[in-house]
């Protein structure tokens, strides 16, 4: 049997026998275009494609629509994988989304959505989520129904303001909503009463800016 040489996601890589976490090359569905992603092969059985990670504020997340579309940062550290790749990938098969969060007091929590996909660019990469479970709040901190994606140069929110400019970062802003994992990074002891921080309201409440976040996806049938 011929060995698979291209992989659409980290689940395929894991199933091929490569079970060490790290950076791998993925291929866009129905294309030869490639993208580098961090694969988490340890959490909850492995096979997770990391689509966002924050940990130290080393990467500026106040980026343009094009940058969020194509991705930025380093898969070994802070990065955004890219809306176009995630949209194409999640449009092909059913994916789950796991969001892992860390606060500054040493606590960890997660939210798991049993179905996640992004619409195409023509629909502003609108997020679709169902089936929330986990420890980071019984209510979804990503507004439901899902919002369009907005950036500093593409305002698609439901606010009289421009949420991306007011809060910083590209996100599925509502008006502006209970979350923004791409907000301004604040260090410990400077992370409360923040209007533009890394927010997940239904876990840590208002104005609390988190220490670390990871968004990762995996096929539902993994």
């Amino acid at each position: 049997k011929e060995e698979q040489t291209t992989f659409r996601d980290c689940a395929e890589i894991f199933k091929s026998g490569l079970t060490t976490s790290g950076i791998y090359t993925l291929t866009f569905p129905n294309s030869t275009e490639e993208i580098k992603a961090y694969c988490d092969m340890d959490v909850g059985g492995g096979g997770w494609t990391v689509i966002q990670h924050r940990e130290d504020g080393s990467v500026d997340f106040q980026r343009t629509w094009k940058e969020y579309k194509e991705g930025f940062g380093s898969p070994l550290g802070e990065y955004w994988l890219g809306n176009e790749f995630v949209s194409q990938l999640t449009g092909q098969h059913r994916y789950v989304l796991k969001i892992q969060l860390k606060d500054w007091e040493g606590n960890e929590a997660h939210s798991l959505y049993d179905h996640f996909y992004l619409a195409g660019e023509e629909s502003n990469y609108r997020i679709h989520l169902t089936g929330l479970t986990g420890t980071a709040g019984k209510i979804s901190s990503i507004s439901q129904p899902g919002s369009d994606f907005s950036t500093k140069d593409s305002d698609n929110d439901k606010c009289i303001c421009k949420c991306s400019q007011m809060l910083s970062g590209g996100w599925w802003f509502d008006a502006c909503g209970p979350s923004n994992l791409n907000g301004q990074y604040y260090p410990q002891k400077q992370n409360t009463n923040k209007f533009n921080g890394i927010k997940w309201y239904y876990w840590k409440g208002s104005g609390y800016s988190l220490k670390a976040t990871t968004m990762m996806i995996r096929p539902a049938d993994f």
């Epitope: 606010c159 009289i160 007011m166 009463n193 309201y201 104005g207």
Partner: nanobody
Framework: EVQLVESGGGLVQAGGSLRLSCAAS????????IGWFRQAPGKEREGVSC????????YYADSVKGRFTISSDNDKNTVYLQMNSLKPEDTAVYYC??????????????????????WGQGTQVTVSS
């Protein structure tokens, strides 16, 4: 650094009055709405009143309409809540909180709780019968 400090709470008899103050620093009231919230033991935090200086708008919960009055002093960067005809059911910890004034949904006048990102530590109000 954004800070909100409440004061003016205390113990008062039913029918009495109190004036709460919320002193804001690190931002100016012109660009923000300030809300007063309260939380009684074992209950959810609830909105009491809100003021938006940019257009002079005020909001009151039905339970306090006609009894409470919200106002602001821009020179002192302070918001006040005058509470008259107090009832035992007004007993709670009272908090003030701030939200950027523009963070409003199209067609709406006021803000969900999760939009208020800066909070004070609270002041206790106890109304005895």
């Amino acid at each position: 650094e954004v800070q909100l400090v409440e004061s003016g709470g205390g113990l008062v008899q039913a029918g009495g009055s109190l004036r709460l103050s919320c002193a804001a620093s690190g931002f100016t009231l012109d660009d923000y709405a300030i809300g007063w919230f309260r939380q009684a033991p074992g209950k959810e935090r609830e909105g009491v009143s809100c003021i938006r200086d940019s257009d002079g708008s005020t909001y009151y919960a039905d339970s306090v309409k006609g009894r409470f009055t919200i106002s602001s002093d821009n020179d002192k960067n302070t918001v006040y809540l005058q509470m008259n005809s107090l009832k035992p059911e007004d007993t709670a910890v009272y908090y003030c909180a701030a939200v950027p004034a523009g963070r409003l949904r199209f067609g709406e006048q006021w803000y969900p709780l999760y939009e208020y990102d800066a909070w004070g530590q609270g002041t206790q109000v106890t109304v005895s019968s």
